[in-house]
């Protein structure tokens, strides 16, 4: 029975060239975080793993940094980074939760921050 | 061409513990995660755990935390594998994979021959 | 853990012929983290498809991998009769990595 949910910082925009964190966190459940997958659309960024520590993908290894926690902060942004992202925490034994941010990335230098929201 | 060559066959005692070595060549071992899985004769496929390429990281399956233990050699390129408090159920061949990337993708590309490890009283 | 169930168990062909086998994942393999692997009687698994559908490193193009999601098939367009073995998905999504049970292609 998967009790969890997902926080995450939701629907968010940021100014092209700066950067931003993408953070979920997992809550209502004592399950055991084993991986936490980071993917924009059906591309692997990031992987944090319990034993394993992190894995940046190259592609990605000059504009993402880990942390903090299991967050991540994606920087030297352009307008191509706009789109979804996904936090995948795979936990023992509940299974998978996914949450999802949509990112706006704003040629303007007014860039603000969505509101927090969750997914069951 | 990479390979990974592993220690003869075992035979053990319940309760025992065996040791089984994993050799590698042709590629630089300080690059690669390895695997290692084992296959109960006439069943299938199970992921025991993985090893980093410095042996500082380990991750190994519920099922076997705290029973197994992996750990490489740098100046030989073998990783090795111990299973601990052996019973009949553990009779079956472990292979040694190497991972396809520079981290634990998890897609084992290249295989050991296997070793195969019986336990009977 | 995600469990991984193949079918058919066996599948009885002849050389020349198309063989489909399937992989149903008991929840979904995001951004297709699975792989086919072929067994011969006596040796180790051989890597055949990643990424669902990524042919590995000197495997021939009549291994042919599709699906996501849940649901997977390996195609074997032609038969030949060094096919004929125990082919294993596996996906590497979720930890801990986990094999489906086989589908043996042989000889009709």
């Known amino acids: 029975m998967m009790t969890g949910t997902i926080e995450t910082t939701g629907n968010i925009s940021a100014e092209k060239g700066g950067s931003i964190i993408l953070q979920c966190h997992l809550s209502s459940t004592t399950a055991q975080v084993t991986q936490v997958n980071w993917e924009q659309q059906d591309q692997l960024l990031a992987i944090c793993n319990a034993d394993l520590g992190w894995h940046i993908s190259p592609s990605f290894k000059d504009r993402v940094a880990p942390g903090p926690g299991l967050g991540l902060t994606l920087q030297s942004l352009t307008v191509n980074d706009t789109g979804e992202y996904f936090c995948i925490y795979h936990t023992y034994p509940d299974g998978t939760y996914t949450g999802r941010i949509f990112l706006e990335v704003l040629e303007s230098s007014v860039a603000e921050h969505g509101a927090r929201f969750q997914i069951p | 061409q990479v390979q990974l060559v592993q220690s003869g066959a075992e035979v053990k005692k319940p309760g025992a513990s065996v040791k089984v070595s994993c050799k590698a060549s042709g590629y630089t071992f300080t690059s690669y995660y390895m695997h290692w899985v084992r296959q109960a004769p006439g069943q299938g496929l199970e992921w025991m755990g993985v090893i980093g390429p410095s042996g500082a990281s380990t991750s190994y399956a519920q099922k076997f935390q705290g029973r197994v233990t992996l750990t490489r050699d740098t100046s030989t390129s073998t990783v090795y594998m111990e299973l601990s408090s052996l019973r009949s159920e553990d009779t079956a061949v472990y292979y040694c994979?190497?991972?396809?990337?520079?981290?634990?993708?998890?897609?084992?590309?290249?295989w050991g021959q296997g070793t195969t490890v019986t336990v009977s009283s | 853990e995600i469990v991984l169930t193949q079918s058919p168990g066996t599948l009885s062909l002849s050389p020349g012929e198309r063989a489909t086998l399937s992989c149903r994942a008991s929840?979904?393999?995001?951004?297709?983290?699975l792989a086919w692997y072929q067994q011969k009687p006596g040796q180790a698994p051989r890597l055949l498809i990643y990424g669902a559908s990524s042919r590995a490193t000197g495997i021939p193009d009549r291994f042919s991998g599709s699906g996501s999601g849940t649901d997977f098939t390996l195609t074997i367009s032609r038969l030949e009769p060094e096919d004929f073995a125990v082919y294993y998905c596996?996906?590497?999504?979720?930890?801990?990595?986990?094999f489906g049970g086989g589908t043996k292609v042989e000889i009709k």
């Open positions: 596996q996906q590497y999504f979720s930890p801990p990595w986990t």
């Open positions: 929840q979904s393999v995001r951004s297709s983290y």
């Open positions: 994979a190497r991972d396809h990337s520079d981290y634990w993708s998890g897609i084992m590309e290249v």
